[in-house]
């Protein structure tokens, strides 16, 4: 029986050009975490295997940093990074737990300010 629960940062926002930490935490289970996969809607961002370490997909290699812990740091954010992210915990003996994070990337306050107040 799967008793664990995934706690995530939920809905988060960050500024364009900035960075964000995607973090999940598995609790209420003694199951061993063997691997955590980080995914967007239709593509893999990264995998952290407890034994074999990190795999980072080539599309994200330049702007994803492993960690902290089993989390993932996404850097140089663009508006296109807005969307759902999933942490998939592979555990033994429980099986798979999935958490969801929604990230909204906002135009920076400087950009907003510049758009609202134009110099005559």
């Amino acid at each position: 029986m799967m008793t664990g629960t995934i706690e995530t940062t939920g809905n988060i926002s960050a500024e364009k050009g900035g960075s964000i930490i995607l973090q999940c935490h598995l609790s209420s289970t003694t199951a061993q975490v063997t691997q955590v996969n980080w995914e967007q809607q239709d593509q893999l961002l990264a995998i952290c295997n407890a034994d074999l370490g990190w795999h980072i997909s080539p599309s994200f290699k330049d702007r994803v940093a492993p960690g902290p812990g089993l989390g993932l740091t996404l850097q140089s954010l663009t508006v296109n990074d807005t969307g759902e992210y999933f942490c998939i915990y592979h555990t033994y003996p429980d099986g798979t737990y999935t958490g969801r994070i929604f990230l909204e990337v906002l135009e920076s306050s400087v950009a907003e300010h510049g758009a609202r107040f134009q110099i005559p």
């Epitope: 893999l44 407890a50 074999l52 997909s57």
Partner: antibody, heavy 119, light 107 residues
Framework: QVQLVQSGAEVKKPGASVKVSCKAS????????IYWVRQAPGQGLEWIGG????????NFNENFKGRVTLTVDTSISTAYMELSRLRSDDTAVYYC????????????WGQGTTVTVSS | DIQMTQSPSSMSASVGDRVTITCKAS??????VAWYQQKPGKAPKLLIY???YRYTGVPSRFSGSGSGTDFTFTISSVQPEDIATYYC?????????FGGGTKLEIK
């Protein structure tokens, strides 16, 4: 350039053990995992397992658990795969491979070591 | 374990033909798929990974696509040197598994 050079062919009796070596050069050994893949005659590829040379951690295909030991000697940049209690269906070419930077895909391969198990 | 079902198991093509090989995973593997080429008596070579990136030095006639459970490997214009067996492989979760292979012959 990256090179993985494996030990020579082996002929073993059923029940015996074999230890295959894989000498790495052309890169920092502890920075990349070493994986092992085998191929029986006329058959496809089968992943045996992998070892993280920086800490010695290993991950195995359950089909081989209890029979395979993956080790490294970082002082000579060499990985080893030992398979015990050999059976005739362990007859295969055994390959060591190395991943890409932060990648699990098998970017570099050794030349292969033929292990024949026969009474 | 995740099964990777590759088809066809063998095929014959003429020089210049477009060739497509498919690989179906028994469960979701996101984009954690690679394709290898193996010539007789030689070690496999990485061609495509993740699953549309060509590895260093791989000719542009080789390409890959897919996500989730369905993946495709294409040779846009087959050359005589492409005679080989091609394998897909998933590294989404251990044990990492390969497809059964597709043997390509030239007519």
């Amino acid at each position: 350039q990256v090179q993985l050079v494996q030990s020579g062919a082996e002929v073993k009796k059923p029940g015996a053990s074999v230890k295959v070596s894989c000498k790495a050069s052309g890169y920092t050994f502890i920075s990349y995992n070493i994986y092992w893949v085998r191929q029986a005659p006329g058959q496809g590829l089968e992943w045996i397992g992998g070892v993280n040379p920086s800490n010695g951690n290993t991950n195995f295909n359950e089909n081989f658990k209890g029979r395979v030991t993956l080790t490294v000697d970082t002082s000579i940049s060499t990985a080893y795969m030992e398979l015990s209690r050999l059976r005739s269906d362990d007859t295969a070419v055994y390959y060591c491979t190395r991943g890409n930077y932060y990648g699990y895909e098998f970017a570099y391969w050794g030349q292969g070591t033929t292990v024949t198990v026969s009474s | 374990d995740i099964q990777m079902t590759q088809s066809p198991s063998s095929m014959s093509a003429s020089v210049g033909d477009r060739v497509t090989i498919t690989c179906k995973a028994s469960q979701h593997v996101s984009t954690a798929v690679a394709w290898y080429q193996q010539k007789p008596g030689k070690a496999p070579k990485l061609l495509i990974y993740s699953p549309s990136y060509r590895y260093t030095g791989v000719p542009s006639r080789f390409s890959g696509s897919g996500s989730g459970t369905d993946f495709t490997f294409t040779i846009s214009s087959v050359q005589p040197e492409d005679i080989a067996t091609y394998y897909c492989q998933q590294h989404y979760s251990t044990p990492w598994t390969f497809g059964g292979g597709t043997k390509l012959e030239i007519k």
